[in-house]
Amino acid sequence: FPQDRPFEDTCHGNPSHYYDKAVRRCCYRCPMGLFPTQQCPQRPTDCRKQCEPDYYLDEADRCTACVTCSRDDLVEKTPCAWNSSRVCECRPGMFCSTSAVNSCARCFFHSVCPAGMIVKFPGTAQKNTVCEPASPGVSPACASPENCKEPSSGTIPQAKPTPVSPATSSASTMPVRGGTRLAQEAASKLTRAPDSPSSVGRPSSDPGLSPTQPCPEGSGDCRKQCEPDYYLDEAGRCTACVSCSRDDLVEKTPCAWNSSRTCECRPGMICATSATNSCARCVPYPICAAETVTKPQDMAEKDTTFEAPPLGTQPDCNPTPENGEAPASTSPTQSLLVDSQASKTLPIPTSAPVALSSTGK
């Protein structure tokens, strides 16, 4: 099409743009390491960083771990996408009593309406079943017929929901006299260590949350308690701790009540790109410990790559590659220790501190 020629010409000589014949227009060329968010990007904002699998690009342009839905009571609602976390919700037959960022900190089974009550609104992943009296105008929970009134929207009797494991409290599903009062959980027998991640214990105004200890009279020294594998973030929200379940990660610090689990690359590897509380990309430590490894025939011409060897294996690497750079693999149990007097290199475990002294000790 001759009329397209001027548009194509405008792209020539401009290294930041290229001409896309399919859409017949100039497109912005994303810089190395960034990927287009659409077929023909027009500006730098149409390019994005690419995160590792199971990570997404958050609002601050950081690669952040997607939440996991691995708990038995959760299912995946939306998958982990390039710009949004995986979203988990309670599995069918349960509802969320304590929400968390992109997930649910505590799921309860939907209530079963007791005798004399029928389902007004079925339970969803977010809400419990709502029950109403079977015959309008008469509530089976009335103390006597003369005290009965039409239940208002906020006072529909509802069975006490049952929490799923790991919260092991039992619950009564029968309404008690008084119409709107719910049966109390038989939780008084249950105890909890002060910093245990379990959230059962003394009844709390907010399901799924409990104070660290019984609050002293007139004291505000109580805190929200999140479910296992969640922590209380700075904004006071229960947030999923990152997962270290990738093969190349190990746990550095555990998930605590007020801080996320942190992950690091397993021994013998190094973090090439970080992520919040974790490492988005681990690579084998690329420089071999000197004089401790052999040079196999098939690695003489290999360039450095970022592919990790299978777990439990670390191929030999070339301590003096032809290209002047280090190969990708290393022995995880070797570290560089320089003895300036003897010019020796001694193998030591990775976990041991590297002390460099003139005596080599």
Epitope: I270, A326, L336, V354
Partner: nanobody, 122 residues
Framework: EVQLVESGGGLVQPGGSLRLSCAAS????????MAWYRQAPGKGCELVSI???????YYTDSVKGRFTISRDNAKNTLYLQMNSLRPEDTAVYYC????????????????WGQGTTVTVSS
């Protein structure tokens, strides 16, 4: 205690060059492996290059052929010569000691020194 001071950053046009330095103290003798990491605004901490105590080097793919890492053990100084700079090299650059041990987690930016800012822009 290990202390690192990075310097040499600045504003440079695409295609230009800079030489970063990292003055180290607290090491004995030749010191351990050393690394350069960088962190672009709002992004993660990224490995750039490593040099071993005996001078063997490693570079991440995006800087190969453009950056050169070196060290002067007598002066306890680490260097990063950056040529053919690109806008995507814009970041705060940090040096890190003994990356084999210290850089397994995503925390090798800003733990030892304040870093030096490199801005590549026309």
């Amino acid at each position: 205690e290990v202390q690192l001071v990075e310097s040499g950053g600045g504003l440079v046009q695409p295609g230009g060059s800079l030489r970063l330095s990292c003055a180290a103290s607290g090491f004995t003798d030749d010191g351990p492996d050393m690394a350069w990491y960088r962190q672009a605004p709002g992004k993660g901490c990224e490995l750039v290059s490593i040099i071993s105590a005996d001078g063997r080097t490693y570079y991440t793919d995006s800087v190969k052929g453009r950056f050169t890492i070196s060290r002067d053990n007598a002066k306890n100084t680490l260097y990063l010569q950056m040529n053919s700079l690109r806008p995507e090299d814009t970041a705060v650059y940090y040096c890190a000691p003994d990356p084999r041990r210290n850089c397994r987690g995503g925390d090798c930016c800003g733990n030892w020194g304040q870093g030096t800012t490199v801005t590549v822009s026309s």
